[in-house]
Amino acid sequence: SIPWNLERITPPRYRADEYQPPDGGSLVEVYLLDTSIQSDHREIEGRVMVTDFENVPEEDGTRFHRQASKCDSHGTHLAGVVSGRDAGVAKGASMRSLRVLNCQGKGTVSGTLIGLEFIRKSQLVQPVGPLVVLLPLAGGYSRVLNAACQRLARAGVVLVTAAGNFRDDACLYSPASAPEVITVGATNAQDQPVTLGTLGTNFGRCVDLFAPGEDIIGASSDCSTCFVSQSGTSQAAAHVAGIAAMMLSAEPELTLAELRQRLIHFSAKDVINEAWFPEDQRVLTPNLVAALPPSTHGAGWQLFCRTVWSAHSGPTRMATAVARCAPDEELLSCSSFSRSGKRRGERMEAQGGKLVCRAHNAFGGEGVYAIARCCLLPQANCSVHTAPPAEASMGTRVHCHQQGHVLTGCSSHWEVEDLGTHKPPVLRPRGQPNQCVGHREASIHASCCHAPGLECKVKEHGIPAPQEQVTVACEEGWTLTGCSALPGTSHVLGAYAVDNTCVVRSRDVSTTGSTSEGAVTAVAICCRSRHLAQASQELQ
């Protein structure tokens, strides 16, 4: 019967006794940087070309005996997971292997860098179709390795890496921490994070998504027909490399940003038990398990958005945190979050010709996060309209006044440490959805965009009594672009988007009174693109 991991990534309409997805990734080449491999295993023979690239350190220990099957174990298994005939994800993908890990599974940053350069040169000499590079390795944070990954990604190569098996924040490791790389954590058959001895999968904001990574059956280098079960984020990354190969084979023109957005969009949502992660990492870690799209074509009409968390600002009074979108993405909204609730809001600002989301810590605060909502919006023209703090008691307001521009997000930022928390909440006048409303002491920022066929609407959900969390979701066919809290409440920790749901978090209810200021309203801005929908219908 079908191995559990292949069943897990397969949409229900393709499920059968055998895993036979519609396109095997035949137009894509996957580079594997790992150990040596047993290329004559019948699972991968003829599918994997062993390049002459080898850059590995000496094995440790005088009593170490090289045994071919042990040296090849990790790489052979991963090659099988990506493109194996029988237990592989992308059965049509061809692979090239580069040896950057020795027989003990150890490598060097310099060896990996030279390997990446080898791929870049190969690509220049003989351009082929889409390229996926699988980096099933993790070492300490390396600015130089991350920079090399960025360069290769900007040359159009899709890089997929393991989050690491240290039960730690993936941002502390490379290449997992490189923003341009698709970083993959590991889950098991119960969709729970994988435990590996006393350690386990890495987590945190640098992880893009999770994938099957425990008891994964794959080619064993022991013999030509042998199979073995292995576990780890390397196996998880191999699944995503395979899924990416299939998506790119179906749509070869996909950019890295489009591919990442699709991987996120088609993932299974909210199935991971977050209790496994450290409490401070739960909100930062994506609750996504990779899956193949239900159809390899026709996803182009959707407005895709993802949430990008910044690094923590740190606790100093004037500390800020910045969240950035990928070069091909539009920043459609910006929000902030602080566990202590002490923050001075957030603003969208230009940096290097691109909008970024900046959150501001407040005096006595433990630090803030900036949260960017990053979307794929072709031909978009977006700008930020700012209203300074108002004199009137009605609060500050700003709207999108340019013809054809629609509101995609609201941010508010204040200079004062205390917003006058005992003022009654400000209510938005009905029938004015295209404007942002805030405290009179705050400056308000509206993200206004013009794009063909773009339409947006505001959706609110208010709860009169104090709640730790208030949510509002966009309905089917609409995509969440903006998430904020209606002003007037003292205990809001911040707002952020989780998939298509806007989440507004408040302080522990027991610490706040149930006065009128206890009311919390979550405000979602939901958008869709009629232009994208029409374009896709024309293609079909």
Partner: antibody, heavy 119, light 113 residues
């Protein structure tokens, strides 16, 4: 039920070409390997090679490499064994058998095709 | 190539008696990754194709009578017919399926004494 049905017996002259077949039914033909096994009169079993119909990957025994060609047509769930120029020493019973990645032994065999090469 | 050697070449056993066939491989077919022996036993009756009896050296194929059993590990294996029946008259082959080319033993002919 699962079965492999082979084409009928053949009598050929040396130098002639021949293609015998093995049709699978009752299972997903593309997901199983098909091997060909030779048994010369009064002798034992010799593995000749195999094919994976899913992608037409083949692997031959060195003893048979270049002597025969294994192919498959997955649209009709059929594997083939062919000779471009038969020799008298090719006289034998030829069996096809299937195996699976997690069960790499031959659990189902065809009934055999007797090939006689004689001038 | 892994060479499979069976002994004896032929065996005559009385009905109801035990028949034992040995098979030796030139290199181990036991693999640490899954702790399995990549060895099978087949029975071939006159005019019929071979039939799978035992796989993974000791696992009986469904429908095979329990008088057939396989044992051994690494390089030395045994097929035992605990109580020979008339219908067991056949040639028995061991096979390794771990490495290419796949190889068979030369066969052991079992007859009734």
């Amino acid at each position: 039920q699962v079965q492999l049905v082979q084409s009928g017996a053949e009598v050929k002259k040396p130098g002639e070409s021949l293609k015998i077949s093995c049709k699978g039914s009752g299972y997903s033909f593309t997901n199983y390997y098909i091997s060909w096994v030779r048994q010369m009169p009064g002798k034992g079993l010799e593995w000749m090679g195999m094919i994976y119909p899913g992608d037409s990957y083949t692997h031959y025994s060195p003893n048979f490499q270049g002597q025969v060609t294994i192919s498959a047509d997955k649209s009709i769930s059929t594997a083939y064994l062919q000779w471009s120029s038969l020799k008298a020493s090719d006289t034998a019973m030829y069996y096809c058998a299937r195996d699976y990645w997690s069960k790499p032994y031959f659990d189902v065999w065809g009934q055999g095709t007797l090939v006689t090469v004689s001038s | 190539d892994i060479v499979m050697t069976q002994s004896p070449d032929s065996l005559a056993v009385s009905l109801g008696e035990r028949a034992t066939i040995n098979c030796r491989s030139s290199q181990s077919v036991l693999y640490s990754s899954n702790n399995k022996n990549y060895l099978a036993w087949y029975q071939q009756k006159p005019g019929q194709p071979p039939k799978l009896l035992i796989y993974w050296a000791s696992t009986r194929e469904s429908g095979v009578p329990d008088r057939f059993s396989g044992s051994g590990s690494g390089t030395d294996f045994t097929l035992t017919i605990s109580s020979l029946q008339a219908e067991d008259v056949a040639v028995y082959y061991c096979q390794q399926y771990s490495s290419f080319p796949i190889t068979f033993g030369q066969g052991t002919k079992v007859e009734i004494k």
